[in-house]
Interface confidence: low
Amino acid sequence: GWVWNQFFVPEEMNTTSHHVGRLRSDLDNGNNSFQYKLLGAGAGSTFIIDERTGDIYAIEKLDREERSLYILRAQVIDITTGRAVEPESEFVIKVSDINDNEPKFLDEPYEAIVPEMSPEGTLVIQVTASDADDPSSGNNARLLYSLLQGQPYFSVEPTTGVIRISSKMDRELQDEYWVIIQAKDMIGQPGALSGTTSVLIKLSDVNDNKPIFKESLYRLTVSESAPTGTSIGTIMAYDNDIGENAEMDYSIEEDDSQTFDIITNHETQEGIVILKKKVNFEHQNHYGIRAKVKNHHVDEQLMKYHTEASTTFIKIQVEDVDEP
């Protein structure tokens, strides 16, 4: 019968002919009366056989990622009789893997949005690289992920490519981060190949800033002839948050005279000081009131950022009008 060994040929061989192995019948006594033949796809072009000895050689560079195995047929003939010594038999030559492919991130570009001030350990996104080398062949396609850029705010799980927050971030200081992840094959050992990808991580706003008055003192004037409902001036606070989180409401905190009111212009986020009761220069020529400002929407769990409302003092001077 046939004496079989497993046949392997390393991919990307740079020798002109590589000895793959030998076909042999146990009836072959070495007196050169047998002739070995190779048939099938690749026979005669990729693989040749020494008909006398049965030695098979690869004469082309092979790429495992293109084709990982060749199925060939073997024949052995007794040249004195022209008859087959063994039944024709199918066998396989496997192309063995070398680490000739770097990891590639196929789903680029990566982009993620995560709320600012998210706690350590919050999952941001998972990046995945693929390696065309053989996953069953050593560590050629076993990947390790690492962070090239993004410390100290982000970390990556070495085996999964899961990016997590490792330090709280404040959108008001920086609203987006470019993280660069490297994937290395050979589990990072010497000779490893690597690929990189960039991840744009945008921070969404949370209401972690209270509105603060731009000025601690405002000076306004009102004519004693002004009717109730007159707008006598505006005050303004700023809030480092954006959108709904920056919407604010102004109100009177202190006005013993109950002469003034403040309404909020929700388009401009200004407070408009309104005359609630008519004033009389001869009766009182100046007033001091205190206004406060608060956010319109505050989540229960963010109340710690909004404990004390910002206040401002408003001095209002009454202008005299000549009376008949």
Partner: antibody
């Protein structure tokens, strides 16, 4: 009222290390950053670094990188600052100062200071 | 050499108004809140002004802070003898990723 109580004065030889402690009380220890600031005799204030006690995240001033280690113990509400390879110019009063809930918010409470003298 | 520049000394007579300046750059004063600390002789620093112009409770309204662009200033009106101290500005610096203090200003109240 927030309190920060620091360990007592130390005298060290050049090349040695010193570890100063700062015990915090009357606030939620894990919510606030803690900084260390030093002041050499007759000199100004110099920021050394900052730690967030909950995760142990630290940022050190470039000048002290490699020589300073800041740690926190949440079970005792204490932060520590260790300075190694001491030299005479490290003679200073070392203060711990409570920061805000964000890295860039002011230091509102300070410890009483710990005098470290480096002398052969 | 401090990242924030303050005059080394300032003086005034009781009742006068004194201003102390603090000059920085875009990465510090230009990007973040300025804070001021008062250090009385032989004591730990004390927060005097925070977030540019806010006073902690217990700080008299004679002390006020302001900021414009990359500079800030501390004003003390109605100067009193107990105001004699060292004053420091401090701010978080984005490019250094850390805090910076001014060199300090020694305020003398002349009698």
């Amino acid at each position: 009222q927030v309190q920060l109580v620091q360990s007592g004065a130390e005298v060290k030889k050049p090349g040695a290390s010193v570890k100063v402690s700062c015990k915090a009380s009357r606030y939620t220890f894990t919510s606030y950053y803690m900084s260390w600031v030093r002041q050499a005799p007759g000199q100004g204030l110099e920021w050394m670094g900052i730690i967030h006690p909950s995760g142990g995240d630290t940022t050190y001033a470039q000048k002290f990188q490699g020589r300073v280690t800041m740690t926190g113990d949440t079970s005792t509400s204490t932060v520590y600052m260790e300075l190694s390879s001491l030299r005479s110019e490290d003679t200073a009063v070392y203060y711990c100062a409570r920061g805000g809930i964000k890295l860039w918010l002011h230091f509102d409470y300070w410890g009483q200071g710990t005098l470290v003298t480096v002398s052969s | 050499q401090s990242v924030l520049t303050q005059p080394p000394s300032a003086s005034g007579t009781p009742g006068q108004r004194v201003t102390i300046s603090c000059s920085g750059s875009r990465s510090n004063i230009g990007s973040n809140f300025v804070n001021w600390y008062q250090q009385l002789p032989g004591t730990a620093p004390k927060l005097l002004i925070y977030t540019n112009n806010q006073r902690p409770s217990g700080v008299p309204d004679r002390f006020s802070g302001s900021k414009s662009g990359t500079s800030a200033s501390l004003a003390i009106s109605g100067l009193q003898s107990e105001d004699e101290a060292d004053y420091y500005c401090a701010v978080y610096d984005e490019s250094l990723q850390g805090w910076v203090f001014g060199g300090g200003t020694k305020l003398t109240v002349l009698s």
